[in-house]
């Protein structure tokens, strides 16, 4: 029962996480104009992975796609790639995990197959979550670097009279969505891997059996032999399941509130 719950919860958490990764990837607010130094601007700029937008004080918003592939920074391309890989792996993981769910019966699928599928989807979720976290972190690092670079030459004076205020960008909402979503997908993946341990049939060690050869009183004790050796044992192969008991170390909990600077 606990295995089913762990697997189901892992699936739901991963589903939410992957939905979040997709949302973050599509969002326009990966970086938003820093208003600390220019709180009086009547034009607000923000950028996503696919387009940049400008919102005027009237509420009119204008977005322009990045209609170039080669002209974009390598880091932005890398972030795009990481997010897409995360989504693809997550989507495949979801597909696999649906069939692996213990509560869903598909034909005569053995529990060992379900265990393998659960483990596969779990690993996929973990890699998917890591891809998202990595992608968001790379972008955040890029923002921090650019922020301090633009701060260094914030005002480029022209004869001391004319000032050109450089637009600085800070963390947008998509970064926080991405981090949380990546974390959830990762947690979901770990839960699936834990559930897999409970689903996997353990190998049965058979007790020593005495074989009496006619006319001899010698007892053979094939202690190390498994059922697969076929030594005429009457013992039936029994699939032994872990009842789902978990040590405290294995209990998964949601992350507490994070303070982002």
């Amino acid at each position: 029962m606990a295995v089913t719950a762990c697997q189901g919860l892992g699936f739901v958490v991963s589903l939410i996480g992957i939905a979040g990764i997709i949302a973050a990837t599509c969002m326009d607010q990966w970086s938003t104009q820093d208003l600390y130094n220019n709180p009086v601007t009547a034009v607000f700029n923000y950028q996503g992975l696919w387009r940049s937008c400008v919102r005027e004080s009237s509420g009119f918003t204008e977005c322009r796609g990045y209609f170039t592939l080669l002209g974009l920074p390598a880091m932005l391309q890398a972030v795009r790639a990481l997010m897409i890989v995360g989504i693809v792996l997550g989507a495949i993981g979801l597909l696999v995990s649906i069939f692996a769910l213990k509560c869903i019966r598909i034909g005569s699928m053995e529990d060992s197959a379900k265990a393998n599928m659960t483990l596969t989807s779990g690993i996929m979720f973990i890699v998917s979550g890591l891809c998202a976290i990595a992608g968001v972190s790379v972008f955040a690092n890029m923002l921090v670097t650019n922020f301090w670079m633009s701060t260094a030459n914030m005002y480029t004076g022209m004869g001391g009279m004319v000032q050109t205020v450089q637009t600085r960008y800070t963390f947008g909402a998509a970064l926080f969505v991405g981090w949380v979503a990546g974390g959830l997908t990762l947690i979901g993946g770990v839960m699936m891997c834990i559930a897999c341990r409970g689903l996997a049939p353990e190998e049965t060690n058979y007790k020593a059996v005495s074989y009496h050869a006619s006319g001899h009183s010698v007892a053979y004790k094939p202690g190390g032999f498994k059922a697969s050796t076929g030594f005429g044992s009457n013992t039936k192969n029994k699939k032994i399941y872990d009842g789902g008991a978990r040590t405290e170390d294995e209990v998964q909990s949601y992350p507490s509130k994070h303070d982002y600077v």
């Epitope: 009086v40 400008v54 009119f60």
Partner: antibody, heavy 120, light 113 residues
Framework: EVQLVQSGAEVKKPGASVKVSCKAS????????MHWVRQAPGQGLEWIGY????????KYNEKFKGRVTLTSDKSTSTVYMELSSLRSEDTAVYYC?????????????WGQGTLVTVSS | DIVMTQSPDSLAVSLGERATINCKSS????????????LAWYQQKPGQPPKLLIY???TRESGVPDRFSGSGSGTDFTLTISSLQAEDVAVYYC?????????FGQGTKLEIK
């Protein structure tokens, strides 16, 4: 047709307050921000502030902060500009002007103006 | 605050001739996000409210004759009237639409020579 009709001329004593109204018609009132601009006799234009009738959000010129209050009444599609602690330098024509939606923050329609005279 | 400086203060041009008014801002009005300039030009005739002529530094407002044109980028802008007509006699103002408080130039009075 978009129209902004302002209230009539006012004569006030120093230290008093004045409330000028601007009635909008010919468009969806809550969809456009309304700015207030003043012009002293023979002088240039000076921006006072704006109000967003949709959520009553306001932004004021620091020069007028604490003395000016912008309000709106959705039921009558009217915006109001109240200026307190009047001084002789506040003698000017006060205009309400609608912020265009796609005009790069420029004001596309203006009221006819309200002359406020501050004199003892 | 962004300071807008217009030149000249007054201008006398013959009918049919070209009139040019300049406007300089103390900070760039070019927005990096969309590469648009946030500057407007207004015309004000005696006893009337200002009328929007040009926005975004170069886009003519609907209904404005095509003899009016705007140009420039960053901090330097120009309003040009290609062929002056009698009804163009007015005071012209440039306005910063990029940052609050919105600021106007001191105005340029255009007269017929």
């Amino acid at each position: 047709e978009v129209q902004l009709v302002q209230s009539g001329a006012e004569v006030k004593k120093p230290g008093a307050s004045v409330k000028v109204s601007c009635k909008a018609s010919g468009y969806t009132f809550t969809s456009y921000i309304m700015h207030w601009v003043r012009q002293a006799p023979g002088q240039g234009l000076e921006w006072i502030g704006y109000i967003n009738p949709y959520n009553d959000g306001t932004k004021y010129n620091e020069k007028f902060k604490g003395r000016v209050t912008l309000t709106s009444d959705k039921s009558t599609s009217t915006v109001y500009m109240e200026l307190s602690s009047l001084r002789s330098e506040d003698t000017a024509v006060y205009y309400c002007a609608r912020l265009g939606f796609t005009t790069r923050n420029a004001m596309d329609y203006w009221g006819q103006g309200t002359l406020v005279t501050v004199s003892s | 605050d962004i300071v807008m400086t217009q030149s000249p203060d007054s201008l006398a041009v013959s009918l049919g001739e070209r009139a040019t008014i300049n406007c300089k801002s103390s900070q760039s009005l070019l927005n990096s996000g969309n590469q648009k300039n946030y500057l407007a030009w207004y015309q004000q005739k005696p006893g009337q409210p200002p009328k929007l002529l040009i926005y975004g530094a170069s886009t003519r407002e609907s209904g404005v004759p095509d003899r009016f044109s705007g140009s420039g980028s960053g901090t330097d802008f120009t309003l040009t009237i290609s062929s002056l007509q009698a009804e163009d006699v007015a005071v012209y103002y440039c306005q910063n639409d990029h940052s609050y408080p919105f600021t106007f130039g001191q105005g340029t009075k255009l007269e017929i020579k």
